[in-house]
């Protein structure tokens, strides 16, 4: 086992004419990231064949905004190495693809936007444990400079990381049956390395990384005693009453699941249900990545597929939290103005506006009278978000389009009779009353509560209401 490491030194316009335009602009800032794909062997493999040796995604580089009028410089790069762990032997010959991606940082409503800027590929021979190899590759008008190496993870050594070595326990010689580890004469070939945590008392291995149990023991690390099946229950009565062996502790006793995992017994052993952020037989592995599907509710996962790569979730509208696990109560922020009703539809926010208001957030106060003509000489009066017409005499209705019956409201007091007239209404007053609406009684001595009637109008004559 080991790690292939790639260090990107620069990405920018190559030499010669036709310098590419900067991929970023003041209007559309962006940042770069890189993807590496490794395949074993030198054969010209189909482009779509998988990255059998592994793949990795870099972190995002710093945000870059082009200076107006300036040529595209070398673009700012992400920090750190791209690391591709390999589990088996290093093949010595390999093919690589390195992709340069641009992430646009403009309007984030629809999540990040990615586009492939450049892709370079090559085939190389490389021994593990050797020095950094430098390379320059061109893709169109772009140039990528990088270094790479393969290194073994202890205790593996050698040009293919297949030999297992460890420091000598004694200065003079290696243990029985173990040879010196050339060219590292101060180290010895190591015995087989069993799976980490495999019980030294109850487990053994014939292949590196495995853990096989001696009789009477079970579990992934041979730490769980096998309970006999003839007893009445897994925690059954003692041998004194049933004649059967007293079982050892149950597989979930003492909770073998780390990091808050919950244990459940299975017919052969136990199973851990791990909390988010952990996995493995005992929830012992943290390092959650995109391969675990950590982004809820359709969030976009950005990060590497290998266990050491961190991830970031870009949440769709309506969700937040590092894993997009929290539904945003966007209505609690009272985004709808002017008394509008807020509706959170999940994928979008809607405001149902009161009459007289409009806009996504009911922010526009409609000019109630705009474009609203009141007919027949009526005048428009704004108020409370609804338009109202004050109609001229003889007309009514919302827009003063209806001919009004002026007598409908019984305007003539004290039993006066109402007559509709082209210019309004006329009241014929009952004896003893006068005025436009027959509202004034006539005094018994013939005087009235009104000033003297105009010439030509006798008390009792119909009064026209002008």
């Amino acid at each position: 086992a080991g790690v292939f490491e790639l260090q990107i030194h620069s990405f920018g316009p190559g030499p010669g004419p036709g310098a590419p335009r900067s991929p970023c602009s003041a209007r559309l800032p962006c940042r770069l990231f890189f993807r590496v794909c490794l395949k074993p062997g030198l054969s010209e493999e189909a482009a779509e064949s998988p990255c059998a040796l592994g793949a990795a995604l870099s972190a995002r580089g710093p945000v870059y905004t082009e200076q107006p009028g300036a040529p595209a410089p070398d673009l700012p790069l992400p920090d750190g190495l791209l690391q591709v762990p390999f589990r088996d032997a290093w093949p010595g010959t390999f093919s690589f693809i390195i992709e340069t991606w641009r992430e646009e940082l403009g309007d984030q409503i629809g999540g990040p936007a990615w586009s492939l800027l450049a892709r370079v590929a090559g085939r190389r021979r490389l021994a593990a444990g050797g020095p950094w190899a430098r390379d320059i590759q061109r893709a169109g008008a772009w140039e990528l400079r990088f270094s790479y190496r393969a290194r073994c993870e202890p205790p593996a050594v050698g040009t293919a990381c297949t030999r297992l070595c460890r420091p000598r326990s004694a200065p003079s010689r290696c243990g029985p049956g173990l040879r010196p580890c050339a060219p590292l004469e101060d180290e010895c070939e190591a015995p087989l390395v069993c799976r980490a945590g495999c019980s030294p008392e109850h487990g053994f291995c014939e292949q590196p990384g495995e853990c096989r149990c001696l009789e009477g023991w079970t579990g992934p690390l041979c730490t769980v005693p096998v309970s006999t099946s003839s007893c009445l229950s897994p925690r059954g009565p003692s041998s004194a009453t049933t004649g059967c062996l007293v079982p050892g502790p149950g597989p979930c006793d003492g909770n073998p699941c780390a990091n808050g995992g919950s244990c459940s017994e299975t017919p052969r052993s136990f199973e851990c249900t791990c909390p988010r952020g952990f996995y493995g037989l005992r929830c012992e592995v943290s390092g959650v990545t995109c391969a675990d599907g950590p982004c809820f509710n359709g969030g976009l996962c950005v990060g590497g597929a290998d266990p050491d790569s961190a991830y970031i979730c870009h949440c769709p509208p309506g969700f937040q939290g590092s894993n997009c696990e929290k539904r945003v109560d966007r209505c609690s922020l009272q985004p709808c103005r002017n008394g509008g009703l807020c509706l959170d539809l999940g994928h979008a926010l809607r405001c149902r506006c009161r009459a007289g208001f409009a806009g996504p957030r009911c922010e526009h106060d409609l000019d109630d009278c705009a474009g609203r003509a009141c007919a027949n000489g009526g005048t428009c009066v704004e108020g409370g978000g609804a338009h109202r017409c004050s109609c001229a005499l003889g007309f009514g209705g919302r827009d003063c389009r209806e001919r009004a019956d002026p007598c409908a409201a019984r305007p003539c007091a004290h039993g006066g009779r109402c007559y509709a007239h082209f210019s309004g209404l006329v009241c014929a007053c009952a004896p003893g009353y006068m005025g436009a609406r027959c509202e004034f009684p006539v005094h018994p001595d013939g005087a009235s509560a009104l000033p003297a009637a105009p010439p030509g109008l006798r008390p009792g004559d119909p009064q026209r209401y002008l």
Partner: antibody
Framework: QVQLQQSGAELARPGASMKLSCKAS????????ISWVKQITGQGLEWIGE????????YDNENFRGKATLTADKSSSTAYLEVRSLTSEDSAVYFC?????????????WGQGTTLTVSS | DIQMTQSPASLSVSVGETVTITCRAS??????LAWYQQKQGKSPQLLVY???NLADGVPSRFSGSGSGTQFSLKISGLQSEDFGSYYC?????????FGGGTKLEIR
Amino acid sequence: QVQLQQSGAELARPGASMKLSCKASGYTFTSYGISWVKQITGQGLEWIGEIFPRSGNTYDNENFRGKATLTADKSSSTAYLEVRSLTSEDSAVYFCARTTVFAPYYFDYWGQGTTLTVSS
Amino acid sequence: DIQMTQSPASLSVSVGETVTITCRASENINSNLAWYQQKQGKSPQLLVYAATNLADGVPSRFSGSGSGTQFSLKISGLQSEDFGSYYCQHFWGLPWTFGGGTKLEIR
């Protein structure tokens, strides 16, 4: 090379359940998701859900909640789709597809499809 | 749910012609869109991902464009093997939905 081999055509009775399988080969099973897609004959495609074999996490289409269950067995590199309480509306071709786990997302390899016929 | 509206639903063209299929999202999905081709009785195949990126092994006569809510797939110089159905699919928020499809037939 990458392959997704789906189980053969199935005939089922209404009310029954059916478990369809999708065996992956040619890549690391736990480094990708597996999505399931339904296609009624002569119609379009409908996404049912996705499972991440490494963690067992699933994300589903609410339209299939209670109807479809997604599981995966890492040891055999096989994903399963169980369709319950079958009706004639479940008669369709069901595809599994390999899904990228980090954005940009896409389904880059598809199984050949399993035809499920529900009939009494 | 985000609705994906594809147009036209079908079109009849001759070999050598250029066609453009469009896909409209009911809300902004930025570039989170893929295009697939499906031939009769076969499974779909990836053509374009992230709206504009050609999948490995796809001929350069195919090209994707667009961002936000409007997307298109262009096929320049149609070949006989290009006939079949085409689908767009978004990847922004759940559920991931497909367009209704465009059936491309030989005239």
